[in-house]
């Protein structure tokens, strides 16, 4: 059976991407 | 109502190739930042690789496990993403979840590694 | 790689009743720009993760305001103002600020 994430609309939902960096860059080893 | 789909998954053998496919629907597709997430027992949940969008030149990230064995692409005009793994190993076996960016999640696709 | 590490591996937590979970990252989450991109998923049995909040405290759309994310830099907390039955689940933690992604491993929360 199919998960479903989101709220439900008759248009599209607009994805969040402000839970990731924009411009990533690696993680330095301490 | 927002969807994302996953397929392609089963068995494979070490060293085999599997191609995964996400379908996604009521969202904007083209603007979202796709992901590739694994889920395993052992390691638990495992970025695989990431592509962004047309502004951002489809720039793609992998883990470093998988560089150079896996390939992920997009079609924005069927609002699909892809997961094209060759390679494959033993520790590569896991529920795989394409998400928009970490915020909406698919139901996940069962890959299974082994002879 | 940055290590998310969460506390406590698992909780009981009476129905109404508040709950605290603890990530803390071995690095500073804090990007350039000035946000910093920690988020919190819930895993409800049998499904898929969902996103809860982004940006330490940001709530996405639709999540119960009873959830609540506060920190900076390295240590971070989700609460839950009063636990709903709704509620049980892993909830984890998740760093967005460098490659690669990586993810706490969990805090299961059952319901007393």
């Known amino acids: 059976s199919e998960t479903t994430t989101g709220t439900s609309s008759n248009s599209s939902q607009s994805t969040s991407n402000s839970g990731l960096a924009p411009n990533p860059t690696n993680a330095t080893t301490k | 109502e927002v969807k994302f789909e996953e397929s392609g998954g089963g068995l494979v053998q070490p060293g085999g190739s599997i191609k995964l496919s996400c379908a996604a629907s009521g969202v904007t597709f083209s603007e979202a930042w796709m992901d590739w997430v694994r889920q395993s027992p052992e390691k638990g949940l495992e970025w695989v690789a990431e592509?962004?969008?047309?502004?951002?030149?489809?720039?793609?990230y992998y883990a470093e496990s998988v560089k150079g064995r896996f390939t992920i692409s997009r079609d924005d005009s069927k609002s699909r993403v892809y997961l094209q793994m060759n390679n494959l190993r033993t520790e590569d076996t896991g529920i795989y979840y394409c998400?928009?960016?970490?915020?909406?999640w698919g139901q996940g696709t069962s890959v299974t590694v082994s002879s | 790689d940055i290590v998310m590490t969460q506390t406590p591996l698992s909780l009981s937590v009476t129905i109404g009743q508040p709950a605290s979970i603890s990530c803390k990252s071995s690095?500073?989450?804090?990007?350039?720009?000035?946000?910093?991109?920690l988020n919190w998923l819930q895993q409800r049995p049998g499904q898929s993760p969902k996103r809860l909040i982004y940006q330490v405290s940001k709530l996405d759309p639709g999540i119960p305001d009873r959830f609540s994310g506060s920190g900076s830099e390295t240590d971070f907390t989700l609460k839950i103002s009063r636990v709903e039955a709704e509620d049980l689940g892993i909830y984890y933690c998740m760093q967005g600020t460098y490659l690669p992604w990586t993810f706490g491993g969990g805090t299961k929360l059952e319901i007393k």
């Open positions: 592509i962004r969008d047309k502004p951002n030149s489809y720039v793609t």
């Open positions: 690095q500073s989450l804090l990007y350039s720009n000035g946000k910093t991109y």
């Open positions: 998400t928009g960016a970490m915020d909406y």
